[in-house]
């Protein structure tokens, strides 16, 4: 009886269970009553990452420098090339097909998480007791200066964008 289902790493064609081609190889000829499946290695700059019956290998991804991309990991016959972004840029999607500049956190906001090649800067508002007076992709919110530890008093209250201003203690009682 011809099979209706095949084992793992096989496929059914013309009532025959044929071996799939291993990762890194493409199908040249299906198996027959007389022959095993014929497979050939993928060429330079090509890959197949699964057991397959593909007659063409996939092209490695091109990391286009004009889009701010560079190679993070070179592709093999079994894996695609992995792109990442140049310093100061991050991917616009999981597939990393293009890059955008890391965003800066405005005054009043600090960096919660520094950007990577694949994720943008995450900003957070400076809470009470902290401030940021610059637009930056690296600076966290800084704590207000503690006037007391310098034996000074607060002359001007701090905000989320400015530090406190300390001054000498008023000696007149």
């Amino acid at each position: 009886e011809p099979p209706t289902a095949c084992r793992e790493k096989q496929y059914l064609i013309n009532s025959q269970c044929c071996s799939l081609c291993q990762p890194g190889q493409k199908l040249v000829s299906d198996c027959t009553e007389f022959t095993e499946t014929e497979c050939l290695p993928c060429g330079e700059s090509e890959f197949l990452d699964t057991w397959n019956r593909e007659t063409h290998c996939h092209q490695h991804k091109y990391c286009d420098p004009n889009l701010g991309l560079r190679v993070q990991q070179k592709g093999t016959s079994e894996t695609d090339t992995i792109c990442t972004c140049e310093e100061g840029w991050h991917c616009t999607s999981e597939a990393c097909e293009s890059c955008v500049l890391h965003r800066s956190c405005s005054p009043g906001f600090g960096v919660k998480q520094i950007a990577t090649g694949v994720s943008d800067t995450i900003c957070e508002p400076c809470p009470v007791g902290f401030f940021s007076n610059v637009s930056s992709a690296f600076e966290k919110c800084h704590p207000w200066t503690s006037c007391e530890t310098k034996d000074l008093v607060v002359q001007q209250a701090g905000t989320n964008k400015t530090d406190v201003v300390c001054g000498p203690q008023d000696r007149l009682r």
């Epitope: 013309n14 071996s19 040249v28 000829s29 299906d30 027959t32 009553e33 007389f34 022959t35």
Partner: antibody
Framework: QVQLVQSGAEVKKPGASVKLSCKAS????????IYWVKQAPGQGLEWIGG????????NFNEKFKSRATLTVDTSISTAYMELSRLRSEDTAVYYC????????WGQGTTLTVSS | DVVMTQSPLSLPVTLGQPASISCRSS???????????LHWYQQRPGQSPNHLIY???NRFSGVPDRFSGSGSGTDFTLKISRVEAEDVGVYFC?????????FGGGTKVEIK
């Protein structure tokens, strides 16, 4: 239905060349190898080699490799075998055959090599 | 090359009686994929070969069930349970496990 139709009988002189054809119909030509088999008068069968019409890849019996050339013309679903530097021992019936989902043979081409 | 040896060379048979043909290979025909690529076919006088059995024991579509194949490794047999007049011809075994593919010398089946 699948059919393999071979070219007509040939008579050649020793040292000459001959090109036999095998026209396929009734299936997708590039999906299956075409093989060639020799049967000398009153003799058994000898496998010459095969060609994959998808990419032109060939495999051969070493005995025939230096004198047999296998080609295809996918636009007319035809396979060819050219045999060069003919000698009297090449006198035989030559079959083309295809397998995969059944086995199919051409009707054979008779080649006579005689001075 | 793998040598395929068939016996007998000639097999006179009586209609309705069984017949058996042996085929031995000079090396094992078990492929690394687990299949054994040993095949049988018939050639009637003046005709192209006609395949009967593939991979030792699988009948091609349309082949009568009086034909059966068996064996493993290097030793194989084709049996005809009850010979009919149309079974006259030469029977060949062949192997496609090893390149070059090779054929047995043939067994001529004739009616007594």
């Amino acid at each position: 239905q699948v059919q393999l139709v071979q070219s007509g009988a040939e008579v050649k002189k020793p040292g000459a060349s001959v090109k036999l054809s095998c026209k396929a119909s009734g299936y997708t030509f590039i999906s299956y190898y075409i093989y060639w088999v020799k049967q000398a008068p009153g003799q058994g069968l000898e496998w010459i080699g095969g060609i994959n019409p998808r990419n032109g890849g060939t495999n051969f019996n070493e005995k025939f490799k230096s004198r047999a050339t296998l080609t295809v013309d996918t636009s007319i679903s035809t396979a060819y075998m050219e045999l060069s530097r003919l000698r009297s021992e090449d006198t035989a019936v030559y079959y083309c055959t295809r397998h995969g989902n059944g086995v199919y043979w051409g009707q054979g081409t008779t080649l006579t090599v005689s001075s | 090359d793998v040598v395929m040896t068939q016996s007998p060379l000639s097999l006179p048979v009586t209609l309705g009686q069984p017949a058996s043909i042996s085929c031995r290979s000079s090396q094992s025909l078990l492929h690394s994929n687990g299949n054994t690529y040993l095949h049988w076919y018939q050639q009637r006088p003046g005709q192209s070969p006609n395949h009967l059995i593939y991979q030792v024991s699988n009948r091609f579509s349309g082949v009568p069930d009086r034909f059966s194949g068996s064996g493993s490794g290097t030793d194989f047999t084709l049996k005809i349970s009850r010979v009919e007049a149309e079974d006259v011809g030469v029977y060949f075994c062949s192997q496609t496990t090893h390149v070059p593919w090779t054929f047995g010398g043939g067994t001529k089946v004739e009616i007594k």
